[in-house]
């Protein structure tokens, strides 16, 4: 006999919520795998700038995305399938995973705050590498997509450390409409915007983290309520 009334509502709410979560994880994983295995991006590993081999920040970022996507899919599946199957075991595992993820988020938040300058530096390096790849290999649509995301999200274009060729390519192709890389080269510097994000606008990242944490707590409560509901319904 299945759960009834309010518990049934929680069951479907948890199902829908986690199905969306699972889908989002699938999208992130798919994009990350595309970025990682597309032959155009793979060339970045072998790219040399002058006499120096290119650093690997681009790939570290992609591996983080792959991990996030995989975890989201796994946790989403547990919540989704556990709710629809009314499985106490799966919901218990789901709850445990959420507790672990919550702890990880808190730890990551503390670590991120302490190391925000290094993270900002890595994000800038990630941007530079994506930009470099988009220019050097003009077929690298994935790198272009990363650059476009940076430019549109941060409303910036290029940086004050651009090479001549990158300046020329950006000027003609990759700056958001309305921005002028030549006259606003320093005003719209993406490096500066990244620094601003990790200093002046750190509260935005904080708000995002709190929202995620609240969702996690909300899901933990729902899964526990559903679990108890299943246990109670199986008694009668």
């Amino acid at each position: 006999m299945g759960v009834e009334g309010c518990t049934k509502c929680i069951k479907y709410l948890l199902f829908v919520f986690n199905f969306v979560f699972w889908l989002a994880g699938g999208v992130i994983l798919g994009v990350a795998l595309w970025l990682r295995h597309d032959p155009q991006t793979t060339n970045l590993l072998y790219l040399e700038l002058g006499d120096k081999p290119a650093p690997n920040t681009f790939y570290v970022g992609i591996y983080i995305l792959i991990a996030v996507g995989a975890v989201m899919m796994f946790v989403g599946f547990l919540g989704c399938y556990g709710a629809i199957q009314e499985s106490q075991c799966l919901l218990g595992t789901f709850f445990t995973c959420l507790v672990i993820l919550f702890a990880c988020e808190v730890a990551a938040g503390i670590w991120g705050f302490v190391n925000k300058d290094q993270i900002a530096k890595d994000v800038k390096q990630f941007y530079d590498q994506a930009l470099q790849q988009a220019v050097v290999d003009d077929d690298a649509n994935n790198a272009k997509a990363v650059v476009k995301t940076f430019h549109e999200t941060l409303d910036c274009c290029g940086s004050s450390t651009l090479t001549a060729l990158t300046t020329s390519v950006l000027k003609n192709n990759a700056c958001p409409s309305g921005s002028n890389i030549i006259s606003n080269l320093f005003k719209e510097d993406c490096h500066q915007k990244i620094d601003d994000l990790f200093s002046g606008k750190l509260y935005l990242i904080g708000i995002a983290a709190i929202v995620v944490a609240v969702i996690m707590i909300f899901e933990m409560i729902l899964s526990m309520v559903l679990c108890c509901g299943i246990r109670n319904s199986s008694v009668y």
């Epitope: 002058g50 006499d51 220019v135 290999d137 003009d138 077929d139 090479t163 390519v169 030549i182």
Partner: antibody, heavy 119, light 112 residues
């Protein structure tokens, strides 16, 4: 050894057209940006145009915009410059050059081909 | 009239040190884009001599050196040799013109 060999230059009347070619060898042509640079008699060098490895990005000097078209055929390892509506001031030696992203400059040049625009 | 200004000519005797200047503006050399130097020996293709203000490609003797200060750059040739007789060009990128710019070239003569 990197080699760039230009051809197609010659005498042409004002308003006429000419197509320059540059045969490349000794490096992976399809992975490199290529460029044209010219030098008018008694003048300094002047950048004309560039093209990216897969022809996605191109740019031109203001003096030739709308008249010149740069293109490439990676299967033939050849760079082209289609010059239309030629003027007397386009008279120059045209050099084909490889653009190095790492060094951010023209690292290898051809010997050049002379284009004379005169009636 | 070239965007980057170079002396039309320079000369020196074998063994001497010669410096060729290249003056630009805040939109090219002063904007932080590297200054590069090319050598064109009579009847040959231009050859990259110095890149990124002061770096030498492999095969270029260490007698050649480059430097940059503000909106100007210079090429120094020490221990001058007769085979150094050539035209020398400086090059940078100009943000106002949105293109690559060159100096008018300096004809170096090795005397005696």
């Amino acid at each position: 050894e990197v080699q760039l060999l230009e051809s197609g230059g010659g005498l042409v009347q004002p308003g006429g057209s000419l197509r320059l070619s540059c045969a490349a060898s000794g490096f992976t042509f399809s992975s490199n940006y290529m460029s044209w640079v010219r030098q008018a008699p008694g003048k300094g060098l002047e950048w004309v145009s560039y093209i990216s490895s897969s022809s996605t990005y191109t740019d031109y000097a203001d003096s030739v915009k709308g008249r010149f078209t740069i293109s490439r055929d990676n299967s033939k390892n050849t760079l082209y410059l289609q010059m239309n509506s030629l003027r007397a001031e386009d008279t120059a030696v045209y050099y084909c050059a490889r653009y190095s992203y790492g060094r951010d400059n023209f690292d290898y040049w051809g010997q050049g081909t002379l284009v004379t625009v005169s009636s | 009239q070239s965007v980057l200004t170079q002396p039309a000519s320079a000369s020196g005797t074998p063994g001497q040190r010669v410096t060729i200047s290249c003056t630009g503006s805040t939109s090219n050399i002063g904007a932080g884009y590297g200054t590069h130097w090319y050598q064109r020996l009579p009847g040959t293709a231009p050859k990259l001599l110095i890149y990124g203000n002061s770096n030498r490609p492999s095969g270029v003797p260490d007698r050649f050196s480059g430097s940059k200060s503000g909106t100007s750059a210079s090429l120094a040739i020490s221990g001058l040799r007769s085979e150094d007789e050539a035209d020398y060009y400086c090059q940078s990128y100009d943000t106002n013109l949105s293109g690559w710019v060159f100096g008018g070239g300096t004809k170096l003569t090795v005397l005696g």
